[in-house]
């Protein structure tokens, strides 16, 4: 219980806002407001899940209004820490008493905010078809009378090509809008930056997304192809696997060929590139083939298209269901 000769502080934590798309920025600021106390020595400590945090992460300032004082302390957190669901506490020691307030990331609410994504061209489109495109994808839009505008531009200020637009209503009632822009192969390879600007009456501000050729080290993919052995009960089907690894950057296209003809993408299943922690990226690709196919010609080719592969940006490996026959 506080004695009557001082007024205890009120402690309140405020949190920095999300960006226009409803996403958390790379860093989050927590502001601890300690207000309305009789001037005197005050000690502010930040806790993470009950543990004292590094004081270097926070800054504090005090002001006096009439007979009462206020102090504020700001804590900067990385997005990773904030999203990890830890609890952050501002603990105030004053006149031998402790006052505190705690906060943590709120549970995701429905519906989520609008998100925009901008893809890079696939290596297949860039190096084989030589007609690269980039796609601006806007998801989680609430269907409304307002029009979503997607505007393309280039950092160089040069004009952009004509884009194609598609709108799709999703099962959950939200709207997805995509705009696909053809880009020049040389422009892309030489490092041009493309921007997609998304505006909508219900968005507090425009969403801007940009994309350009990935910088950083280059490494060509290694390709290994395998056939699984015959499995009881499935004599007329066989699974082929392709491991593609140690490539950088992560952009890669994977194709399977039979009889010198590229098989439709729907025929195979390929993982997203994963990091190896030091050797580059890897993907696995899986293709199911039928007896009719391998009896016609028992050679299947797994091909990777990647900018660091030479010659002609492709590496491929052949695999047979029954090698040696």
């Amino acid at each position: 219980v506080c004695s009557r000769d001082f007024t205890p502080p009120t402690v309140k934590i405020l949190q920095s806002s999300c960006d226009g798309g409803g996403h958390f920025p790379p860093t989050i600021q927590l502001l601890c407001l300690v207000s309305g106390y009789t001037p005197g020595t005050i000690n502010i400590t930040w806790l993470e899940d009950g543990q004292v945090m590094d004081v270097d992460l926070s800054t504090a300032s005090t002001t006096q209004e009439g007979e009462l004082a206020s102090t504020q302390s700001e804590l900067t957190l990385s997005q990773k820490h904030w999203l990890s669901d830890r609890t952050y506490t501002c603990q105030v020691t004053y006149q031998g008493h402790t006052f505190e307030d705690s906060t943590k990331k709120c549970a995701d609410s429905n519906p989520r905010g609008v998100s925009a994504y901008l893809s890079r061209p696939s290596p297949f489109d860039l190096f084989i078809r030589k007609s690269p495109t980039i796609t601006c994808l806007v998801v989680d839009l609430a269907p409304s009378k307002g029009t979503v505008n997607l505007t393309w531009s280039r950092a160089s200020g040069k004009p952009v090509n004509h884009s194609t637009r598609k709108e799709e209503k999703q099962r959950n009632g939200t709207l997805t809008v995509t705009s696909t822009l053809p880009v020049g192969t040389r422009d892309w390879i030489e490092g041009e930056t493309y921007q997609c600007r998304v505006t909508h009456p219900h968005l507090p501000r425009a969403l801007m997304r940009s994309t350009t050729k990935t910088s950083g080290p280059r490494a060509a993919p290694e390709v290994y192809a395998f056939a699984t052995p015959e499995w009881p009960g499935s004599r007329d089907k066989r699974t082929l696997a392709c491991l593609i690894q140690n490539f950088m950057p992560e952009d890669i296209s994977v194709q399977w060929l039979h009889n010198e003809v590229q098989l439709p993408d729907a025929r195979h299943s390929t993982t997203q590139p994963r990091k190896t922690k030091g050797s580059g990226f890897f993907v696995f690709s899986r293709l199911e083939v039928t007896r009719a196919e391998w009896e016609q010609k028992d050679e299947f080719i797994c091909r990777a298209v990647h900018e660091a592969a030479s010659p002609s940006q492709t590496v491929q490996r052949a695999v047979s269901v029954n090698p040696g026959k």
């Epitope: 790379p26 860093t27 900067t76 990773k80 950083g216 990091k275 030091g278």
Partner: nanobody, 122 residues
Framework: EVQLLESGGGLVQPGGSLRLSCAAS????????MAWVRQAPGKRYEWVSS????????HYADSVKGRFTISRDNAKNTLYLQMNSLRPEDTAEYWC???????????????YGQGTLVTVSS
């Protein structure tokens, strides 16, 4: 948007020194571990060094230990690599890099700068 811009590369004689800088913008630099990586012509890329957010924890590849020093100035949003006793085998493109998850050792980083070329030759 994360942006990294390296500078300080150039031609230096064996045994000489260079200091690379990396100016960061578009993110809270002081909240991210940072790294330097390099790639010699025709060779695989190599992680060189990493430093934690506060600059207290540093790691080095065996090939540069005792010769290179990584440091950072969070007030200036800048990462440095002091390279002493340079050898011809240090000739490479050097990039500063960071990652949303892990940048304190070898990795395929989320973000790289445009690179700066270091040539060690007499």
């Amino acid at each position: 948007e994360v942006q990294l811009l390296e500078s300080g590369g150039g031609l230096v004689q064996p045994g000489g020194s260079l200091r690379l800088s990396c100016a960061a913008s578009g993110f809270r630099f002081g909240n991210y571990d940072m790294a330097w990586v390099r790639q010699a012509p025709g060779k695989r890329y190599e992680w060189v060094s990493s430093i934690d957010t506060g600059g207290d924890i540093t790691h080095y590849a065996d090939s540069v230990k005792g010769r290179f020093t990584i440091s950072r100035d969070n007030a200036k949003n800048t990462l440095y690599l002091q390279m002493n006793s340079l050898r011809p085998e240090d000739t490479a493109e050097y990039w500063c890099a960071t990652d949303e998850e892990y940048a304190l050792g070898p990795n395929e980083f989320d973000y790289y700068g445009q690179g700066t070329l270091v040539t060690v030759s007499s």
